[in-house]
Amino acid sequence: AGVFELQIHSFGPGPGPGAPRSPCSARLPCRLFFRVCLKPGLSEEAAESPCALGAALSARGPVYTEQPGAPAPDLPLPDGLLQVPFRDAWPGTFSFIIETWREELGDQIGGPAWSLLARVAGRRRLAAGGPWARDIQRAGAWELRFSYRARCEPPAVGTACTRLCRPRSAPSRCGPGLRPCAPLEDECEAPLVCRAGCSPEHGFCEQPGECRCLEGWTGPLCTVPVSTSSCLSPRGPSSATTGCLVPGPGPCDGNPCANGGSCSETPRSFECTCPRGFYGLRCEVSGVTCADGPCFNGGLCVGGADPDSAYICHCPPGFQGSNCEKRVDRCSLQPCRNGGLCLDLGHALRCRCRAGFAGPRCEHDLDDCAGRACANGGTCVEGGGAHRCSCALGFGGRDCRERADPCAARPCAHGGRCYAHFSGLVCACAPGYMGARCEFPVHPDGASALPAAPPGLRPGDPQRYL
């Protein structure tokens, strides 16, 4: 277990031309707050996918009113860190989304209005326990400067917060086989690993794999509170309490999640899954409306005039998703030729070509015959990214270098004998047969069963069957 910490240093106009308009005015003073969303791994997930590692909201910053005529300065920031606790191991690689929100403090009906000013995202590698990492991200004309780190909560240590440390039992050294815990040299690495999911607050173990409950808690993972009040249906004794056990109020009883959020119990307490447009531990941060500009990539927002009504993003060509944050798969049109593999890289389509083809769409058939000589009078034939030789009579093989044996297939019928010849083969026929392949019997009366004479030949003319 541990905590990811984010420190915002500044949020203001980025360098270069086109400074953004101040988000606040004398008529509409405002203040900023930030939201961070963390996801494990380096996958570039959609903005709407769950913050699987956790999320946090900052406090509101000081109220800011624009000074007329003055350039937009760095805007006043909320105090303190944004802290995202993580229960399991720190993954080492993570994706983040940091959103800058504006809260307008005018006299609008229904309380303050929120709008999203900027959203930055990135993917990073970070070891727990390391120093603060500094970063600068730009979103349009805005620039956000921040630092972040991951630190383990005792007794966890290590780059993934998976090693446990306990105070030394003896002042001089650790027990057999146990190492001192850097950087906490006065502590020893703990070999005990309790049952997976055992509550770190209400459970403990003295043997690996067990989960023993502190007083007032029960269940296999010590996550269920118990009551010692009298009860009608005893649930059995407990070493911690006398009488009977009655499950106490569950963390989701009465549904602490506002705005239609759904509650699920966690080993520590509860977790709210908020409907689109609501944030916060209990989904208490107000709904996003079209005024907040929730549609990315030029999407057109329709509906959602007030936080109670849903908005719909009509996405421009090439984008989709509930906030137009996803690209359409353009490869489904199969633009690559000659069996090339299509890759949609976002900024462009790429084709990975099969051997023998090239070009942006694999449209060029490489000259397979270039520099490929076919021996012995053979001719090169291109096709399908590979060359092939059409060999002269009497030769074979890939490059026509092998002398073909025309007699190998035993072409002479009826016991005729085959002789290789420069122009092919010659059959010496057995008695009673004739023809180029000895295929025609000679009839006893002297007539032959030759096929009808071709035009221009009279029966009896000598015929060459070669």
Partner: nanobody, 120 residues
Framework: EVQLVESGGGEVQPGGSLRLSCAAS????????MGWYRQAPGKQRELVAG???????KYAESVKGRFTISRDNAKNTVYLQMSSLRAEDTAVYYC??????????????WGQGTLVTVKP
């Protein structure tokens, strides 16, 4: 720059027909692939029909036998003849083209979309 201009969308009753047209213009050297996608509210955009880079035609399973794609190479135009229309064909239909530009680069372009509504 290349423009794709769609036309022919509208409202039709179930079982009816519509013909969509998409004309490409601009600094086009050749059109490598061209076709029609559609996107219904809350759904992913999907390819309906198209001419692939190889020149073959490709259809979504749900429209086979009902929709026919054709083209006029001289006009750089593709057509989508839609018949036996169903309520589930209601969507914004987008023309898409993979174009080889005069500078020999390839770029993928989208039209602005035309709405097809099928309702009794």
């Amino acid at each position: 720059e290349v423009q794709l201009v769609e036309s022919g969308g509208g409202e039709v009753q179930p079982g009816g027909s519509l013909r969509l047209s998409c004309a490409a213009s601009g600094s086009i050297f050749s059109i490598n692939a061209m076709g029609w996608y559609r996107q219904a509210p809350g759904k992913q955009r999907e390819l309906v029909a198209g001419f692939t880079g190889e020149g073959s035609t490709k259809y979504a399973e749900s429209v086979k036998g009902r929709f026919t794609i054709s083209r006029d190479n001289a006009k750089n135009t593709v057509y989508l003849q839609m018949s036996s229309l169903r309520a589930e064909d209601t969507a914004v239909y987008y023309c898409a083209a993979d174009v080889q530009l005069l500078n020999s680069d390839y770029e993928f372009y989208w039209g602005q979309g035309t709405l097809v509504t099928v309702k009794p």
